[in-house]
């Protein structure tokens, strides 16, 4: 999987969208690693 900063951000956006945004406040691009996906 792509692990660049931009890929991580887009992937997290998709995850947040699918979860309805119901995730921890610290679940942000700069504070998650690729393993979080």
């Amino acid at each position: 999987a792509c692990d660049t900063a931009t890929c991580v951000t887009h992937r997290l956006a998709g995850l947040l969208s699918r979860s309805g945004g119901v995730v921890k406040n610290n679940f942000v691009p700069t504070n998650v690693g690729s393993k979080a996906f």
């Epitope: 792509c2 660049t4 900063a5 931009t6 890929c7 951000t9 887009h10 997290l12 956006a13 947040l16 942000v28 691009p29 700069t30 504070n31």
Partner: antibody, heavy 119, light 107 residues
Framework: EVQLVQSGAEVKKPGASVKVSCKAS????????MNWVRQAPGQRLEWMGV????????TYNRKFKGRVTITVDKSASTAYMELSSLRSEDTAVYYC????????????WGQGTTVTVSS | DIQMTQSPSSLSASVGDRVTITCKAS??????VAWYQQKPGKSPKALIY???YRYSGVPSRFSGSGSGTDFTLTISSLQPEDVATYHC?????????FGQGTKLEIK
């Protein structure tokens, strides 16, 4: 309203260094990566590097061979790009850019900073 | 580094025309491609991410497609305000790289 406001135009001599700032507002600065991109006259956009403002980790374009340094001041929500050993080919418009998810899912760019390198 | 080759370099079309700009990557970048619109003297504006997704606020006449090495930006019905230079970018690998730009003019 999300804004990335960059410092003003600079004129530098060959061999000198330049430091461009990018002040972020309207979002949580440390939550999102900050990129720096430049555009020389008549040339394609060129990515210089990215910083994770949360912990300061950087990734640079190897083309710049250690001449570029990206830093942040978290307390001021400001990113900096310093380019050293300037040459005429570094004459360009320099942009900061950040891809956000909140408050809006969008790729925001600063207004650009013109750096002219001339003897 | 990944080379992104855009074509054409420039094009002239009439209002209402369907316009297609292509971008070819030198190796597989999946769908990790973005498209930007840049008007003279302005910063690039994001249009498309992940090859085919429009950012909120981008008119529906803009669409993107492709995967692997071949990507397309289409404007379904050209408007006068679409006069600009369009750039593709791959972000699958560092360093991110851009196409050389396509300058779009109105006939």
């Amino acid at each position: 309203e999300v804004q990335l406001v960059q410092s003003g135009a600079e004129v530098k001599k060959p061999g000198a260094s330049v430091k461009v700032s990018c002040k972020a507002s309207g979002y949580t600065f440390t939550d999102y990566y900050m990129n720096w991109v430049r555009q020389a006259p008549g040339q394609r956009l060129e990515w210089m590097g990215v910083i994770n403002p949360y912990q300061g980790r950087t990734t640079y374009n190897r083309k710049f061979k250690g001449r570029v340094t990206i830093t942040v001041d978290k307390s001021a929500s400001t990113a900096y790009m310093e380019l050293s050993s300037l040459r005429s080919e570094d004459t360009a418009v320099y942009y900061c850019a950040s891809l956000l998810i909140r408050p809006h899912y969008f790729d925001y760019w600063g207004q650009g900073t013109t750096v002219t390198v001339s003897s | 580094d990944i080379q992104m080759t855009q074509s054409p370099s420039s094009l002239s079309a009439s209002v209402g025309d369907r316009v297609t700009i292509t971008c070819k990557a030198s190796q597989n970048v999946g769908t990790n491609v973005a498209w930007y619109q840049q008007k003279p003297g302005k910063s690039p504006k994001a249009l498309i991410y992940s090859a085919s997704y429009r950012y909120s606020g981008v008119p529906s006449r803009f669409s993107g497609s492709g995967s692997g090495t071949d990507f397309t930006l289409t404007i379904s019905s050209l408007q006068p305000e679409d006069v600009a230079t369009y750039h593709c970018q791959q972000y699958n690998f560092y360093p991110y790289t851009f196409g050389q730009g396509t300058k779009l003019e109105i006939k």
